[in-house]
């Protein structure tokens, strides 16, 4: 039977969701040997119904809150090895908040909170703007929210402030939440590596470009800024 005498270790990781895409709220626990003895409940602060419930090897969604209907799942075949992570379809801005992962097993009970941030973030692409009158770089990223800051840097002129020779614009996308980020850097020199860094409180993304006489090399990466 299910006992509540002891506490078990439940571990969560603060994470961020990209609105309009699928997200994962991470939660792990000390595994049990019988799936039928495991209950997983996901709750959200300020929400009356459950976010998700999984018990006896199946979802139990009769108490699920309307805002999560048809949008949640667990990795059911991984529950037995201690994975209680919640999958969230079509992340909304309103999904942000404090969630509780609550676990009951034959060994006991445990819970842990996680902060889930929502916004939009995307990889930037830096290109040479051949339409411009002078040597110009154009950095574009299709989806960001909240409005990020954009900073240019260069390998050769480390520490230089490029705000005077760059121009950044934000264009609202059709769904009226996220924005397209476009930043232009003027007067660039050849044989130099330039970086376009886009950052908000959820993510930080960098697009690098190296222009030489013979070739153009690009690289980009994105990092989520998980709150601790």
């Amino acid at each position: 039977g299910i006992s509540g005498r002891h506490s078990i270790t439940v571990t969560t990781v603060a994470s961020a969701g990209n609105i309009g895409e699928d997200g994962i709220l991470s939660c792990t626990f000390e595994p049990d040997i019988k799936l039928s003895d495991i209950v997983i409940q996901w709750l959200k602060e300020g929400v009356l119904g459950l976010v998700h419930e999984f018990k006896e090897g199946k979802d139990e969604l009769s108490e699920q809150d309307e805002m999560f209907r048809g949008r949640t799942a667990v990795f059911a075949d991984q529950v037995i090895v201690g994975n209680a992570s919640l999958r969230l379809k079509n992340v909304q801005l309103t999904d942000a908040g404090t969630y509780k992962c609550y676990i009951i097993t034959s060994k006991g009970k445990g819970n842990a909170n996680l902060e889930y941030k929502t916004g939009a973030f995307s990889m930037p692409e830096v290109n040479v703007d051949y339409n411009a009158s002078s040597e110009t770089l154009r950095c574009e990223a299709p989806r960001w929210f909240p409005q990020p800051t954009v900073v240019w840097a260069s390998q050769v002129d480390q520490g230089a402030n490029f705000s005077e020779v760059s121009n950044t614009s934000f264009e609202l996308n059709s769904e009226n939440v996220t924005m397209k980020v476009v930043s232009v850097l003027y007067n660039v020199t050849i044989n130099n590596t330039y970086s376009c860094m886009i950052e908000n409180d959820i993510a930080k993304a960098t697009g690098d470009i190296k222009v030489t006489e013979s070739e153009i090399k690009r690289r980009s990466h994105l990092q989520l800024l998980n709150s601790k």
Partner: antibody, heavy 115, light 107 residues
């Protein structure tokens, strides 16, 4: 109770395609990956690939080199496996299956490829 | 691809016997191993997953052990309905691969 019910036997000519369905019931369809496995007469089982019904994501056995496509229709809790450019060695029983969690597999669909 | 070597390929046993079947992976697959039972003309049935976890509705006389490269399926007291072919499957790395099977026959 958990059930996987597959479509009936098929006879196909070499070069044709076959699409086998697997209707799931008794559990939340989006919570478990659906795998496809085949067994040629007298042979060992062979894994073909899986679909994640939550988002439609797939993973395939490269042995089938783009000939296999696994899809889902979440509104009817049904998974599909399509195999194209059929050859005689594709004659086998095809199963939809859980790798973990539930014991049940589909009952199997015999696909015979013959000219 | 990861090779799964199952042994023995067949065995004869009596009702009430303790039966052990082993599966060896050609590389470390952690606990990503499942065991299946298949009777002639029937669909396979999942017995054990993640090396040690009993699938829903499977009798407790079936158990699994092992991790890494060496795995064992044990039937503690063989019943008449257990005479069948047993397969292991590694699902640690794509493509997932099955063992060759072990046929358990009546002595």
């Amino acid at each position: 109770q958990v059930q996987l019910v597959q479509s009936g036997a098929e006879v196909k000519k070499p070069g044709a395609s076959v699409k086998v369905s697997c209707k799931a019931s008794g559990y939340t369809f989006t919570s478990y990956y659906m795998h496809w496995v085949r067994q040629a007469p007298g042979q060992r089982l062979e894994w073909m690939g899986y679909v994640d019904p939550f988002n439609g994501g797939t993973s395939y056995n490269q042995k089938f080199k783009g000939r296999v496509t696994i899809t889902v229709d979440t509104s009817s809790s049904t998974a599909y496996m399509e195999l194209s450019s059929l050859r005689s060695e594709d004659t086998a029983v095809y199963y939809c299956a859980f790798i973990a969690g539930f014991a049940n597999w589909g009952q199997g669909t015999l696909v015979t490829v013959s000219s | 691809d990861i090779q799964m070597t199952q042994s023995p390929s067949s065995l004869s046993a009596s009702v009430g016997d303790r039966v052990t079947i082993t599966c060896k992976a050609s590389q470390d697959i952690k606990s990503y191993l499942s065991w299946y039972q298949q009777k002639p003309g029937k669909a396979p049935k999942t017995l054990i997953y993640y090396a040690t976890s009993l699938a829903d509705g499977v009798p407790s006389r079936f158990s699994g052990s092992g991790s890494g490269t060496d795995f064992t399926l044990t039937i503690s007291s063989l019943q008449p309905e257990d005479f069948a072919t047993y397969y292991c499957l590694q699902h640690g790395e794509s493509p997932y691969t099955f063992g060759g099977g072990t046929k358990v026959e009546i002595k």
